[in-house]
């Protein structure tokens, strides 16, 4: 007996071939011997089966001795043994229809769990293997669970259902609602304008919610809310903003914030949260601001940085076109009685310059 696997909602062709390539009598019946369809003269006739309105056959293939039955909009309960009677012989085809669905909405927040449930006909014992867009393999039986969704789980999941050495493939589109980056750091010289961008890792037809940026300045004892905003159909509107600093926010996505000036008192780290309508939980993105200041006071040339820097970052002062350099894995470096010329303050990570500031030292006569 031939076994054919089908997908719920899909269309399947059950083949039945006669030895002679000519138009002949044929009938398709179910396991209860109820006629589904057949031929009477040149007419396709339908029987009393509940399948009849979804069953069809291709007249153009009858001349080739092919009397297939096509079943549209498959249901789990269509799983049955179907009998094709042609040329005084009977061909049996066992059809097994499976369905695979996500238990919840397929738009899930990062960190939430995903459960896929397999619908299968009674008496079947299928196995399921799913592969995430990032290449993660998960196996299961009637259910498959992914406890904590990550950004890279967004996309098309491919699940293979196996039964009797046959397979059928399901594709399920999962959207993980998250920002493109978990964290980002902006490096700026004192006085420069700061641009913070928070691109989303997904697109939705309608995007509505509300958000807030909390800021913990390095110099401050507690964090404070810098801005709150609403999002309606991808349009951003500011609800409340602090007076110091007076942030500006873009009206369109991606979420975009502008700080007019980078100042040492603003250096620190922030947490932007976004709560989406009809979703439990919030999206988060951490943002850091590192500010550099180079100053000369009397005989002392100083370079300082404020904000969250890793201990492996190097701060250097060097005289342009000269070998004179002072470097430290610290947040401040200085040179006493510096030579006249253009000095560069550099913040670097393994040789890669993250931030630089130039200061001119004039000769003192």
């Amino acid at each position: 007996k031939k076994v054919v696997l089908g997908k719920k909602g899909d269309t399947v062709e059950l083949t039945c071939n006669a030895s002679q390539k000519k138009n002949t009598q044929f009938h398709w019946k179910n396991s209860n011997q109820i006629k589904i369809l057949g031929i009477q003269g040149l007419f396709l006739t339908k029987g009393p089966s509940k399948l009849s309105d979804r069953a069809d056959s291709r007249k153009s293939l009858w001349d080739q001795g092919c009397f297939s039955m096509i079943i549209k909009n498959l249901k789990i309960e269509d799983s049955d043994t179907y009998i094709c009677e042609v040329e005084n012989k009977k061909e049996e085809v066992e059809l097994l229809v499976f369905g695979l669905t996500a238990n919840s909405d397929t738009h899930l927040l990062e960190g939430q769990s995903l459960t896929l449930t397999l619908e299968s006909p009674p008496g079947s014992s299928p196995s399921v293997k799913c592969r995430s867009p990032g290449g993660k393999n998960i196996q299961g039986g009637r259910t498959i669970s992914v406890p904590q969704l990550e950004r890279q789980d967004s996309g098309t999941w491919t699940c293979t259902v196996s039964q009797d050495q046959k397979t059928v493939e399901f594709k399920i589109d999962i959207v993980v609602l998250a920002f493109q980056k978990a964290s980002s750091t902006v490096y700026k010289k004192e006085g420069e304008q700061v641009e913070f961008s928070f691109p989303l890792a997904f697109t939705l037809e309608k995007l509505t919610g509300s958000g807030e940026l909390w800021w913990q300045a390095e110099r401050a004892s507690s964090s404070k809310s810098w801005i709150t905003f609403d999002l309606k159909n991808k349009e951003v509107s500011v609800k409340r903003v602090t007076q110091d600093p007076k942030l500006q926010m873009g009206k369109k996505l991606p979420l975009h914030l502008t700080l007019p000036q980078a100042l040492p008192q603003y250096a620190g780290s922030g947490n932007l949260t976004l709560a989406l309508e009809a979703k439990t939980g919030k999206l988060h993105q951490e943002v850091n601001l590192v500010v550099m200041r180079a100053t000369q006071f009397q005989e002392n040339l100083t370079c300082e940085v404020w904000g969250p820097t890793s201990p492996k970052l190097t701060l250097s002062l060097k005289l342009e076109n000269k070998g004179a350099t002072v470097s430290k894995q610290a947040k401040a470096v200085w040179v006493l009685n510096p030579e006249a010329g253009m000095w560069q303050c550099l913040l670097s990570d393994s040789g890669q310059v993250l931030l630089e500031s130039n200061i001119k030292v004039v000769p003192t006569w």
């Epitope: 089908g6 269309t11 040149l42 007419f43 291709r58 001349d63 096509i70």
Partner: antibody, heavy 115, light 107 residues
Framework: QVQLQQWGAGLLKPSETLSLTCAVY????????WSWIRQSPGKGLEWIGE???????NYNPSLKSRVTISVDTSKNQFSLKLSSVTAADTAVYYC?????????WGQGTLVTVSS | DIQMTQSPSSVSASVGDRVTITCRAS??????LAWYQQKPGKAPKLLIY???SFQSGVPSRFSGSGSGTDFTLTISSLQTEDFATYYC?????????FGQGTRLEIK
């Protein structure tokens, strides 16, 4: 609701090979046959050929020697290649879904053969 | 190949008129016939299949009849949106063939 979206080169020189692809969105790819049909002012609607998910093909005998229809089930796409084109192959080419009747069609691609 | 011949090749009518288009097959095709409507710059749209069955969403003013070699498409009361070209197609045997079309114009 099934949607068929087709694309391919619109301007060819005589003797070149016409190449078109049709992608199927939002419906079942299995169980159906996927056809190519062309329409020219001179010959009206002309069925070129068809393919199913398994790669089984049927072609119009008048074009069979020049036609190849192939399928990529991983992408729910099927393609048409028509070799050694002449000005007589200038037409609007359509992809369509069929069991016995063409119930869903692509938007059509005008292919012009000119030296 | 089965030849499909439509008549008339064009017809002029007014809104509200009853219009009949015929299609003749060069050999018997039982009821393996479909009717399509095509508007300029668009793909054909299936109206009637199996000679007399309605495709979903098709208005009831369209009807099909016939069997064997002679078939008819009738529009009981013409609407503005019905002015188009109509084609018949046989699904009895390969190669599938179409009629040459009937152009329905506003009088």
């Amino acid at each position: 609701q099934v949607q068929l979206q087709q694309w391919g080169a619109g301007l060819l020189k005589p003797s070149e090979t016409l190449s078109l692809t049709c992608a199927v969105y939002g419906g079942s790819f299995s169980g159906y046959y996927w056809s190519w049909i062309r329409q020219s002012p001179g010959k009206g609607l002309e069925w070129i050929g068809e393919i199913n998910q398994s790669g089984s093909t049927n072609y119009n005998p008048s074009l069979k020697s020049r036609v190849t229809i192939s399928v990529d089930t991983s992408k729910n796409q099927f393609s048409l290649k028509l070799s050694s084109v002449t000005a007589a192959d200038t037409a609007v080419y359509y992809c369509a879904r069929v069991i016995n009747w063409f119930d869903s069609w692509g938007q059509g691609t005008l292919v012009t053969v000119s030296s | 190949d089965i030849q499909m011949t439509q008549s008339p090749s064009s017809v002029s009518a007014s809104v509200g008129d009853r219009v009949t288009i015929t299609c003749r097959a060069s050999q018997g095709i039982s009821s393996w016939l479909a009717w399509y409507q095509q508007k300029p710059g668009k793909a054909p749209k299936l109206l009637i299949y199996a000679a007399s069955s309605f495709q979903s969403g098709v208005p009831s003013r369209f009807s099909g009849s016939g069997s064997g070699t002679d078939f008819t498409l009738t529009i009981s009361s013409l609407q503005t949106e019905d002015f188009a070209t109509y084609y018949c197609q046989q699904a009895n045997s390969f190669p599938y063939t179409f009629g040459q079309g009937t152009r329905l114009e506003i009088k």
